[in-house]
Each structure stands twice: as C-alpha cells, then as structure tokens.
C-alpha cells in the first residue's frame, strides 16, 4: 500500500544489467519538496540489498557521493549471478521511533554474454514430418537470452524462428513446422543459431546438411508374417513402409533368446523371405528402414511382431530305457521309460507316443499309444523281444527308436568293475568305473541309472538314467539329485544282446544320521543272540548309511562297551552275536554311520542270555 517511487528515483550506472565481476553505482535521489518535513538537512538515504526477498546487507558504508538531504550514490561490487534487488530508504534521524520510509528500488541482473551455440543437430521424423533442430547453448547466462534458428536452403528461401531462455525455461530446440520433401534430396541446407542478450551476442558455426542427412524414416508398421504351406521354418515377413525407403534391417529372435538374427534387405518393398526359422517357436520380429543405401539414418525399430511358428513333424531320437521284473515262471513285466524330446526336436506339442513291443522270432507284436513317458506290459519270458517308441505331434511322428530287451544284469562277464560314487557338490555325484574284464562281446554303450533309496521308490518313481558312449568311464549325475539322500546307482554295460551291471550307493552330501536303529527284539537261538531292528526312517538317514554298530555292556558296568560293526544292507534287519556270558544282564543299543559320522544311539534293550555262550 506504499506508493513506491513517489518520494524519489533510483538509477544504475552503467546499466541495470552488468557482467559478472563488474561494479555498479546506484544513485538514490529525492524528488523536490520530499524528505524529512522539519529538518531537510537531517535527511539520510540508506540502500538495502535483498537476495530472494531476504535482506542481506545495509550498504551504508558504500557511499561514494552524498548531497546531504538530496541524493546519495553507492558503489556495489561482488554481485553474484542472477537478480539482486536494491531498495533506497529515507531515514529521518530526528524521529527515532519512525522506521525508514521506502523511496524507490532497482533490480540489477548479473550474467554473462552467450557462448556460441554448438552441436546443432536437425531431424525430420518421417517423409511427412517437420524439421526440428536442437543445439547446445553452452554456459547458463543468468539473463533472458534470445535464440534465433535460421535455416537457408533452395529457392532462395530462409526460414527462421525464435525462442528464449531465462530462469524459468530453457531454449535449446525448435521445430520449424516445415516439411522437407524427397524432391529436395540433392539440395543443401545451412542452419545456424544466433544467441543474443543484454551483454552481447554470438553465432554458431554454420552447419550444412542434406535431406538424406536429417530425414529419419518412420518405423515400419503393420508387420505380419505368412508361413508358406504352414511351414514351421519358412515364412514371408511383410510390412508397410514410407515410399522412399530403399533399405531395411530385419531382426528376429526366439523370445527366450539374448541375441538377434540380423538381415539387411535392399529394395525389399515391404516383403522378405525367411528360411531358417525354428518350428513351434515363439519369435519376435522387428524392422528398421533407411532412405539411402550409404547415407542417412536408420528409423527406430518397429513395434515387435510376436508370433509362434507352425509345428513340423518331430525329429531326433527318443532316449529309451526299461526295467524287467519276473512275475512267475513264464511271465515277465516290462516297463518302458523314455525322456521327452527337447523343444527343437519335438517341433510342436507332442500329442502321444506310439509304443511297440515285438517278439523277434514269432513276430508277435503289441502296439499302443500313450500320452505318458512310460508304458508297462506283461509278456512271456521266452523269446527275444525288442521295443520301439516314436513321438507324434499334429504334423507327424518321429522315426521310431529301437531297443533290444535283454537281461540287464544277466551276464557277469559284462559287469563293469571298480564302480565308485563321489559327491562333487550339493547336487551332483561323479560315478566312475572300469570296463568289464572278460566281456565276450563288445560293449555298445553304458547306462548309468539311479533312484532314491526310499520306500516304494521302485514302484512310485521312474528311474533316471544317462547314456554313456563305450569309450567313456565316468558320468556326472545331477538330474533330481538332492543333498542328504542316498541313491542306488547302477552302471549297466550293454552289448547287442546281453547286459551286465554293477551297483553302488552314493550321495551328494551327507550328515550323521539323526537317530540310531530301533532294536525290536533280542532272541536266543542255538547259543547265539539274534538282534532284530527296524531301519532308520528315510528322512533321518541323511545320506548313505555305511554300516550299523551294535553295542553291549554289562548292565551296571562302567567299562567301555563292546561293539560289532555290520556292513549296511537294506534287506538285512537282524544279526547274530555270540560273545555274551550266560545269566549276565546286558544293555544293548545300535547306531548308524554315514561318511559324515555316527548317529546318536537308538533305544536301549536289556537282555540276559540263558544258554551257554561261546
């Protein structure tokens, strides 16, 4: 509500806009008949400095000139970049109670002259787009700075447009709104940017370009693919492009891939044949365009086309294995197992498997289809049998895989020697062996088969197996291997018509068992004691049990117990001991040992042998 500048004026020399580091003189003058009413000579003019509306300094000591009661000149130095407000006030010294009265004020701007704009770059997006240029303005000037973009070209024409930068907005890009058309392909354009503010002006170096240098085609659109005769490996990719495009780049990859297949296509006219696609595979396709073979810029990549190639008939060989179990004197159960084809072999969704069991001499054939990866049949024990399996999808079936059904462990001379199983790390086991010593027929391949030694595993879970060439003597097994579980591992050596095998137990990691075996009964037979027990529950074994220990001592004795160590066999659950005295009461217990150590003891049982002990 104060009428500012009614009392006087404030002026700045050399100007209200000054370069950084310069000084300025600010003069504050009272208008005639203004000032302190009673004592004009007591007029005191003071100058206050404000930055961001905050009083930062009273410039009382910076007076360089004083007409008492009429005007004062102050010198200001070391002004920081940006805007500083100075307010002149009148202080009537005879009246201490009244605050100084504002006379007038001035804003001084400190900045720098603009640097020449650099790195001018112009772009037109698409044949129907408009020319937009951007540049680097250089250092901030802290002043309102006007920029003029000037584009000169054919037909004696110059186009120009302006914008400005200040503390609220930055100007480093302008769209001229004008379109350069292909008829100007050979023409040259010159662009320059001029910057001007109150402290000076500067111009960029002229930048020359042609239509081809700056026009970036729009990315192709409406991308589609047509698979020839529903082929899964050949397709024609089609798209729409701007009319002047002469070069395209195509990239495509399966969706789970990390590297693109790249193709350059000249004068494709929106069409290109691809011949190396993988059937039944999700692909991503993208296309980019260019207006000139050597010059110009590539468009952005198009939006992705995602599609799955059609199926083709499966290729590859199924990996088959089997188990034989005699049911009675003239019948056996054959269980066939096979591994799923990998996607590149299946080339589609496998709908079913065709399984055939054939007796070679009598020409008996059992055929069936199944959607599972196993098949079980009861067949006569006589005759030579062969099995074959093929996989079928909507386009056809794979070539059948044949396997001769032989007695897998029937020939001792074919049994591999020195089979060992070493834990490599948490989830695999290294199995090694030596070839059969006196095989009377050549080993065609080895099969390493494994399954967890848990109750019902033979019936509940299919086996895992690896096929190993005959010149290899080791296998690293990792499929379905878990720590702290014991696996039965068999190494089969197969010839054309015979099989031999050796068995071992192994684990990938072990701990001492959680508990010892539970003694269920102690019986006396023919001057020997038979200790019977139940095995440690499967989850508590924590690896392969190497042996059991039976401990005993006289009931109240403090002596060390005696012990008997038994090699672990899964089928065994009793063992005789014969070194106990008759009519002495003993305490007995058992422990189990893995490669990691011994379990705590199982339950204790007391027993007093009656008969004569040896």
């Amino acid at each position: 509500n104060i009428d500012v500048c009614k009392l006087g004026t404030v002026t700045v020399q050399p100007a209200p806009v000054i370069p950084l580091g310069s000084a300025a003189n600010i003069s504050c003058s009272l208008n005639p008949k203004q000032g302190c009413s009673h004592y004009p000579s007591s007029n005191e003019l003071i100058l206050l400095k404000f930055v961001n509306d905050v009083l930062v300094e009273n410039l009382h000591g910076k007076k360089v000139h004083d007409h008492t009661g009429h005007s004062s000149t102050f010198q200001v130095t070391n002004l920081s970049l940006g805007m500083t407000l100075f307010v002149c006030k009148l202080n009537c010294s005879n009246s201490q109670k009244k605050p100084p009265v504002p006379v007038c004020g001035v804003e001084i701007s400190v900045g720098v002259a603009p640097e020449p704009p650099q790195n001018i770059s112009c772009v037109q997006e698409g044949e129907n787009g408009t020319v937009a240029c951007s540049w680097n303005s250089g250092k901030v000037t802290y002043l309102k700075t006007n920029y003029t973009l000037q584009l000169s070209g054919p037909n004696n024409l110059t186009c120009q447009k302006q914008c400005f930068s200040d503390n609220r907005q930055n100007c480093n890009r302008l769209d001229l709104g004008i379109n350069l058309s292909p008829d100007l392909a050979e023409s040259r354009f010159i662009v320059r940017v001029t910057a001007i503010n109150d402290l000076g002006n500067s111009s960029s170096l002229p930048h020359t370009f042609t239509f081809l240098d700056i026009v970036i085609p729009l990315p192709p659109w409406d991308i589609r693919i047509n698979f020839l005769n529903a082929s899964g490996s050949r397709g024609t990719l089609q798209w729409e492009d701007e009319g002047q495009v002469v070069l395209n780049q195509l990239r495509y990859q399966p969706l789970n891939s990390t590297s693109w297949n790249m193709v350059n296509a000249t004068n494709a006219k929106g069409k290109y044949d691809l011949r190396d696609l993988r059937p039944f595979t999700e692909y991503e396709f993208q296309i980019s365009s260019k207006l000139h073979l050597s010059g110009g810029s590539w468009s952005n990549w198009s939006e992705s086309l995602r599609t799955r190639t059609p199926e083709e008939e499966p290729v590859g060989i199924l990996d088959i294995w089997y188990m034989k179990q005699d049911i009675d004197y003239d019948r056996q159960q054959i269980s066939l197992f096979w591994k799923s084809l990998n996607p590149s072999e299946a080339r589609g969704k496998i709908l079913h498997y065709q399984v055939t069991l054939q007796e070679v001499t009598k020409k008996t054939t059992l055929q069936n289809t199944t959607r599972h990866t196993s098949w079980t049949r009861v067949i006569p024990r006589t005759g030579a049998w062969t099995a074959s399996v093929s996989a079928a999808n909507s386009k056809g079936a794979s070539a059948p895989t044949h396997i001769n059904i032989v007695d897998l462990c029937g020939t001792g001379l074919l049994a591999p020697h020195q089979v060992s199983a070493k834990s490599e790390n948490m989830d695999n086991i290294l199995v090694t062996w030596q070839p059969p010593k006196k095989a009377d027929s050549a080993v065609r391949e080895y099969i390493v088969e494994w399954r967890a030694l848990q109750p019902g595993s033979i019936t509940k879970f299919p086996p895992h197996w690896l096929r190993i060439p005959p010149d290899n003597m080791s296998a690293l097994i990792s499929e379905n291997i878990k720590p702290y579980i014991c696996y039965e591992i068999r190494v089969h050596a197969l010839s054309e018509s015979q099989g031999g095998c050796s068995s071992i137990r192994g684990d990938s990691k072990h701990k001492a068992p959680v508990s010892g075996p539970h003694i269920t009964a102690i019986t006396e037979k023919k001057e020997r004691l038979f200790i019977s027990w139940t095995h440690i529950p499967f989850p508590e074994q924590r690896g392969c049990i190497l042996h059991y220990r039976i401990y005993w001592k006289e009931r109240d004795s403090t002596a060390q117990p005696e012990l008997c160590e038994i090699q672990y066999r899964r089928s065994q659950n009793s063992h005789p001991i014969s070194s106990l005295q008759p009519r002495v009461t003993y305490v007995l217990w058992m422990t189990a040992v893995t490669a990691a150590g011994e379990s705590p003891q199982g339950n204790e049982r007391e027993f007093c042998p009656q008969g004569k002990a040896n």
């Epitope: 186009c159 447009k161 004008i178």
Partner: nanobody
Framework: QVQLQESGGGLVQAGGSLRLSCAAS????????MGWFRQAPGKEREFVAA????????FYTDSVKGRFSISGDGAKNTVYLQMNSLKAEDTAVYYC????????????????????WGQGTQVTVSS
C-alpha cells in the same frame, strides 16, 4: 471462404520504411501460411515473405532478408510486413496470400500453392 484485404502501401523514398497489413476474414488461419508476394511491371510474381501461424516460423526470400520482417496478430487475424531500408527495386504491387497445409519447403515460395489472394497494394520507392 477466406477474404484477404491488404493496406499500407504508398510512395516512399529509398531508405525509408513502410508497414503493410493484411486482414483475413471468413475463417481462422491457425493452420495456414500467410505470405506476401510482389509483382513489378513486366515481371513474374515473386515470393517475399511468409508466416506459418501454428509454428511461428518466418520465411524470407534472400533479397529482403534482414530488411523486411513479417509478424502476425492472431487476435486480429492480421499479418504485417515491416519493410525497412527500401530500395527502388522493391517497387511492385504487394499481394497477400494464404495457403492450407501441408507446408513443404518446396511449396512455400511458389504462388500456385496459395489458395487465397488479396487484391494487392502498390508500393513505390523513389530514388
């Protein structure tokens, strides 16, 4: 339909200044290019300057660059041509013209691409 009306022409000494105005009526010119052409006796009509309303871009022929300045007042639907440092060879009838999109470099300076024309105003520069 767009009507264009020029004014501001007259006789001026070499080195002097004139300001031509072109008022448009009939519809807004927000997407148009408004241009000035001139035709001297016995010569073809030639492009002088143009203003692209939507982009705010100005176009000049080389012979007037730096001397003439085109501007517009959207509220009044009027385009102005400020002519300074006039020369005898600037003597001509000055026509205001307007064109609809698209706006191509190849078309800006060519009279056949302009759909609407004014009657013209005479500018004479005496030496």
């Amino acid at each position: 339909q767009v009507q264009l009306q020029e004014s501001g022409g007259g006789l001026v000494q070499a080195g002097g200044s004139l300001r031509l105005s072109c008022a448009a009526s009939g519809r807004t010119l927000s997407n148009s290019v408004m241009g000035w052409f001139r035709q001297a006796p016995g010569k073809e009509r030639e492009f002088v300057a143009a203003l692209m309303w939507s982009a705010g871009s100005e176009f000049y022929t080389d012979s007037v660059k730096g001397r003439f300045s085109i501007s517009g007042d959207g509220a009044k639907n009027t385009v102005y041509l400020q002519m300074n440092s006039l020369k005898a060879e600037d003597t001509a009838v000055y026509y205001c013209a307007a064109k609809n999109p698209p706006h191509r470099w190849s078309d800006i300076g060519k009279s056949p691409h302009y759909e609407y024309w004014g009657q013209g105003t005479q500018v004479t520069v005496s030496s």
